[in-house]
Interface confidence: low
Amino acid sequence: AQGKEVVLLDFAAAGGELGWLTHPYGKGWDLMQNIMNDMPIYMYSVCNVMSGDQDNWLRTNWVYRGEAERIFIELKFTVRDCNSFPGGASSCKETFNLYYAESDLDYGTNFQKRLFTKIDTIAPDEITVSSDFEARHVKLNVEERSVGPLTRKGFYLAFQDIGACVALLSVRVYYKKCPELLQGLAHFPETIAGSDAPSLATVAGTCVDHAVVPPGGEEPRMHCAVDGEWLVPIGQCLCQAGYEKVEDACQACSPGFFKFEASESPCLECPEHTLPSPEGATSCECEEGFFRAPQDPASMPCTRPPSAPHYLTAVGMGAKVELRWTPPQDSGGREDIVYSVTCEQCWPESGECGPCEASVRYSEPPHGLTRTSVTVSDLEPHMNYTFTVEARNGVSGLVTSRSFRTASVSINQTEPPKVRLEGRSTTSLSVSWSIPPPQQSRVWKYEVTYRKKGDSNSYNVRRTEGFSVTLDDLAPDTTYLVQVQALTQEGQGAGSKVHEFQTLSPEGSGNLAV
């Protein structure tokens, strides 16, 4: 930020009424008045170029220092070319000297050269030649010097002429401040610039209203340089929750908007399914029936539990059931839908029911399912099963109601036996089978049906209580169709697949396991 100048003395602005001291009086510097831009302007001038040994002094009034440590002196002046004067005026000079003296009191008209310290010799960049002077095109020079540190209550400046033709149009003395500043939503107070060039004054900033230092962030600080410039900003403030940055201030979020944390972000419009927020809201409340899960960001629309799975089918296959369903028609506005399957079995005779999770087997864990189908096996025959599929999402836990659909299925058959060929010969086939253990108690016999492949007119049946049988008196090198079926008190169970097994040819021998 640009330095602020605090003016201590401005000759040009004073309209010639400062009454500076001249020494010697009336013989050197004197106050002149001219019109520039339709206004009177004043200047102190001296032009004793034809006389040698000039030592003319012009002293300002006493200037109160106040809080200044380093002062800056800006001079605007003209210097006429010595060649403008006859013979070049051998004693003519084209420079003058600038001095200062500090004091705790005003000496009035008591002028003592010895109290003054030279600041510099002031030389013009451009001199006004005779033709320019006659055409009123004077060359105005601007020079600036600085002095510091100052320690007394006030000071004087003085100008020494040693034989030049000078007009001093403006003398402006000022000191510099780093101006009051708002940066990074922090307020930095007006600060006096230091007097030593290398030093930078560290200044702490304060967050503007409704702004805070973010957690873990640095407190705002800036450095005030000698020239009144703010440098090296450190840290910042952010608008607190419920407020957003508007220019250099934090403004409350408008109704219908919110901001949930201190950040650089603007306020956001309240998401869907929220109630209109008041001014300065940090969040937007959900509409009735809508919820926000703990992990949901405040910017996310409020959501609700899903409706029940849209369509549920249970297809029985022996002692297995395949459950299939379609997603809920209303997802509740969320994508984190999962399904849970529960099972209840009922005895047809008594109507007694109970959970069956322990006795059945699911193709995948029945809770937290993301797919829309599951196979349930190891079901007992001649039982009624009711399956419940519940749809849940991230906000289902926030309500007591559940969204589910049920499907019932009666298991009238055992699961088909799984059949294996244990061994064979030229005239026999050894066959075994298995069914799930829960169903075995309901089977009293197994019926094995077999026939030659291609012969649909005749077949043979063998019954056994065991889990294997050897079929004898078979033709060599012949394929037989074999099926095993469980028999229960209630009738026939499900039959196995029809398997093709072939006896060995006469060249082969022995009982070979397959």
């Epitope: 010639g16 009424e17 008045q33 001219n34 019109i35 831009n37 339709d38 206004m39 009177p40 009123r136």
Partner: antibody, heavy 120, light 109 residues
Framework: QVQLVQSGGGLVQPGGSLRLSCAAS????????MHWVRQAPGKGLEWVSV????????YYADSVKGRFTISRDNSKNTLYLQMNSLRAEDTAVYYC?????????????WGQGTLVTVSS | SSELTQPPSVSVAPGQTVTITCQGD??????ASWYQQKPGTAPKLLIY???NRPSGVPDRFSGSSSGTSASLTITGAQAEDEADYYC????????????FGGGTKLTVL
Amino acid sequence: QVQLVQSGGGLVQPGGSLRLSCAASGFTFSSYAMHWVRQAPGKGLEWVSVISPAGNNTYYADSVKGRFTISRDNSKNTLYLQMNSLRAEDTAVYYCARASVGATGPFDIWGQGTLVTVSS
Amino acid sequence: SSELTQPPSVSVAPGQTVTITCQGDSLRSYYASWYQQKPGTAPKLLIYGENNRPSGVPDRFSGSSSGTSASLTITGAQAEDEADYYCNSRDSSGTHLTVFGGGTKLTVL
């Protein structure tokens, strides 16, 4: 309404004195430089004097220097011209005028004029 | 002090264009102002600066300047424009005076 209303003119003997007044209204009087301009019968306009807005700077035409004094009372919004040692050649209509910009004009507001006759 | 010189009189037919001139060294440095004065009344500002008209001044009045000369031009003169016209300028001689020209009597025939 911006206006300048003059008073104080009349007949005066040579060597005598007269004080002209110019009352301003409708504008911030203390912000403007004010002038007196005169016009001898059948002649052109002649600038007489100027006073700065605060009253701390005054200038005069050589023809009146040392005899006329321009002054102003910003608290009364009034401009004055004190004329001493009057001569026959001072006979004229005297106008007060406002300098619209800076010290020297242009003169955008004029008084109605007041006749000063110096005669024995 | 500087002097500004104007022709004592000019005339113009109604509806015609007329130019009144003003000569003086001070015009090298400063623009002229122009005033109209009708008999028995105070002067009225017509033109100031480069060519500026106060509100209420008809646009048939215009000003220009070049070197040591300034001009007031009336384009399409009207009977009510018959009056005395004065130029005025700051004095460039450094004596802090403002000077008037001698005035020009405009007659609309």
